[in-house]
Interface confidence: low
């Protein structure tokens, strides 16, 4: 690989829609890993510090962000679906972690929106007590 | 897989960081429905994947669309797929 072309992913977690919760009594979190090259990543969801597989669906392969470009950067998405009551519990904590060339990137959903996000690429979510 | 009670819906999601990305989730649709790629190079749409909530014995199809475009809207995100008009759910404004 041309190491000059290595770009780590940016990872973000998107919280469930209140409309989905209201309509289905379920809550889907979406994790997006974007802008990485090459396409060697591993994505995992962690709930309360433990890796989970049930309720998880991840794209089978990364998507080229610019399909016409041979060396396009890539994106990958994943969904985690839980019950509305599980999401609503503020003690529950959700994190999406993306492994890229040994780097662990993650984003997390936190109650305190003013805290700086750590350099790790992760996405995590506390069951929201407020925003 | 066979989806027992399809209830197709498109929901708009909000990110944990103040980023410019808008995300739309298309979920709970029938397995016969196909999700088309966007003709807009600035809008990214994943293939459909199946999610299995084993503890609830519940499976659902889903696809995600996202974009950094300021005028990106969930109502038009999947416009190249055949989606009934009543699948689009409102995204309440943040009160924070």
């Amino acid at each position: 690989e041309d190491l000059k072309k290595v770009f780590p992913p940016k990872v973000a977690v998107f919280e469930p829609s209140e409309a989905e919760i209201s309509h289905t009594q379920k809550a889907t979190l979406v994790c997006l890993a974007t802008g990485f090259y090459p396409d060697h990543v591993e994505l995992s969801w962690w709930v309360n510090g433990k890796e989970v597989h049930s309720g998880v669906s991840t794209d089978p392969q990364p998507l080229k962000e610019q399909p016409a470009l041979e060396d396009s950067r890539y994106s990958l998405s994943s969904r985690l679906r839980v019950s509305a009551t599980f999401w609503h519990n503020p003690r529950n904590h959700f994190r999406c972690q993306v492994q890229f060339y040994g780097l662990s990137e993650d984003d997390e959903w936190t109650e305190d929106r003013d805290k700086p996000i750590t350099q790790k690429i992760s996405a995590e979510a506390w069951g929201r007590a407020d925003c | 897989p066979y989806i027992q009670n399809p209830d197709p819906a498109v929901y708009q999601l909000r990110g944990s960081k103040s980023n410019d990305t808008s995300v739309c989730l298309f979920t709970d649709f029938d397995s016969v429905m196909n999700v088309s790629q966007s003709k807009d190079s600035d809008v990214h749409i994943t293939d459909k994947t199946v999610l299995d909530m084993r503890s609830m014995d519940f499976k659902s199809n889903g696809a995600v669309a996202w974009s950094n475009k300021s005028d990106f809207a969930c109502t038009s995100a999947f416009k190249d797929s055949v989606i009934p008009a009543d699948t689009f759910f409102p995204s309440p404004e943040s009160s924070c």
């Epitope: 007590a129 | 409102p90 009160s95």
Partner: nanobody, 117 residues
Framework: DVQLVESGGGVVQPGGSLRLSCVAS????????YGWYRQAPGKEREKVAH???????DYADSAKGRFTISRDESKNTVYLQMNSLRPEDTALYYC???????????WGQGTLVTVSS
């Protein structure tokens, strides 16, 4: 906290109309969605209609064309106008609010609607 108080229930003949009201108090500025639900004797509670803070509405199939959900933000009140009532609409009608503050999900005590000749 959010408190919800329903009113407007009663006895009505088939084909008649009723308007239910749900008054919200407390942290109402944190509410994203209101909904009306109903529970008939011996049956599970079911959705009737939802309304978002953007006034987007969503109805159960059984309510489409007959029921209308609306809200008056200045009065913190949500209404359910029910027309062409049928005996199968007989139920305890509950107001629900979804908030951005834990515990998120609030319910009223319910108001009884009886459709009978």
């Amino acid at each position: 906290d959010v408190q919800l108080v329903e009113s407007g229930g009663g006895v009505v003949q088939p084909g008649g109309s009723l308007r239910l009201s749900c008054v919200a108090s407390g942290y109402v500025h944190k509410i994203n969605f209101y909904g009306w639900y109903r529970q008939a004797p011996g049956k599970e509670r079911e959705k009737v209609a939802h309304i978002s803070i953007g006034d987007q509405t969503d109805y159960a199939d059984s309510a489409k064309g007959r029921f209308t959900i609306s809200r008056d933000e200045s009065k913190n009140t949500v209404y359910l106008q029910m027309n062409s009532l049928r005996p199968e609409d007989t139920a305890l009608y509950y107001c629900r609010a979804l908030s951005r503050i834990w515990p998120y999900d609030y319910w009223g005590q319910g108001t009884l609607v009886t459709v009978s000749s």
